[in-house]
């Protein structure tokens, strides 16, 4: 003979557990159907009548299959600096991560609870690593031979250019400023050629310089104040 | 829906200690309270400890209280029993169920359970 099905609600054997979308009520000390998501249990089960359902009201939802009394309120709109990704609706709840240049400085269940703006590095210092969904941008002192001149969350050291003749060296924040190999009658005090570059940037190898046929005073032109060390802008 | 397997069981002297751990699979354990069961043969399933989904609030058995620590990880979708100065009457096999948005303790019911762990305290 085929086994009998049982209609919930119904005693379980004992050891036994419930079925698929049954629970154990504690109280009625049967197994009882659960609420499919988007609904709660209006009605407990009894030992002689089965769980009683209804949808979510407006702003609240279950995202489970359950016999909760009431819905989940859903969270509170997304602020300014979050974007909705996924909206309220009676089976799920709403969703805000960090619009782009944010991350997360404060995870909730699911989404972000606060956002923070993303570090930018100063000129004299790179991305050292980037920031993501979770985590801030790390900056790094620009090391020798490699520079930076931007405010930025994404900008990393580049390389020096590298010069036939250098007119002015390049530091931590200014990139090398190169002469023309031809020597200039008509030079006005101060003035600075456009770089010429011998080679790409992406050589990291810097030669020795050539003896420069710029003035050697253009080697004391003052650079600007120093960043501080951090290097990071408290944007 | 949550599967869960219960490890940590093992054989250990009076007043030794076992970390029992409760592993969620198919769903992630942190919309659900937790409860942990016991069975000795031939008596009733009693509900030991439990945590709710938020994870704000615990409960204990009288039997229990001062002994076990309940404990969640939601970032492991792990739950644990830490139980210490055990003794002869804390063997059982122990389980441990679920309850979806479960917001009090003892859980007013029950979801799907684990095979369960044995834990023997004897000299």
């Known amino acids: 003979l085929p086994a009998q099905v049982a209609f919930t609600p119904y005693a379980p054997e004992p050891g036994s557990t419930c079925r698929l979308r049954e629970y154990y009520d504690q109280t009625a000390q049967m197994c009882c159907s659960k609420c499919s998501p988007g609904q709660h249990a209006k009605v407990f089960c009894t030992k002689t009548s089965d769980t009683v359902c209804d949808s979510c009201e407006d702003s609240t939802y279950t995202q489970l299959w359950n016999w909760v009394p009431e819905c989940l309120s859903c969270g509170s709109r997304c602020s300014s600096d979050q974007v909705e990704t996924q909206a309220c609706t009676r089976e799920q709840n709403r969703i805000c991560t960090c619009r782009p240049g944010w991350y997360c400085a404060l995870s909730k269940q699911e989404g972000c609870r606060l956002c923070a703006p993303l570090r930018k590095c100063r000129p004299g210092f790179g991305v050292a690593r980037p920031g993501t969904e979770t985590s801030d941008v790390v900056c790094k002192p620009c090391a020798p031979g490699t520079f930076s001149n931007t405010t930025s969350s994404t900008d990393i050291c580049r390389p020096h250019q590298i010069c036939n003749v250098v007119a002015i060296p390049g530091n931590a924040s200014m990139d090398a400023v190169c002469t023309s190999t031809s020597p200039t009658r008509s030079m006005a005090p101060g003035a600075v050629h456009l770089p010429q570059p011998v080679s790409t940037r992406s050589q990291h190898t810097q030669p020795t310089p050539e003896p420069s046929t710029a003035p050697s005073t253009s080697f004391l032109l003052p650079m600007g104040p120093s960043p501080p060390a951090e290097g990071s802008t408290g944007d | 829906e949550v599967q869960l397997v219960e490890s940590g069981g093992g054989l250990v002297q009076p007043g030794g200690s076992l970390r029992l751990s409760c592993a969620a699979s198919?769903?992630?354990?942190?919309?659900?309270?937790v409860a942990w069961f016991r069975q000795a043969p031939g008596k009733e399933r009693e509900e030991v400890s439990c945590?709710?989904?938020?994870?704000?609030?615990?409960n204990y058995a009288d039997s229990v209280k001062g002994r076990f620590t309940i404990s969640r990880d939601n970032a492991k979708n792990m739950v644990y029993l830490q139980m210490n100065k055990l003794k002869p009457e804390d063997t059982a096999r122990y389980y441990c169920?679920?309850?979806?948005?479960?917001?009090?303790?003892?859980?007013?019911?029950?979801?799907?359970w684990g095979q369960g762990t044995q834990v023997t305290v004897s000299s």
């Open positions: 198919g769903s992630r354990l942190d919309y659900y309270a």
């Open positions: 169920t679920t309850e979806p948005y479960g917001s009090s303790c003892p859980l007013s019911g029950y979801d799907t």
């Open positions: 945590i709710t989904y938020s994870g704000g609030s615990t």
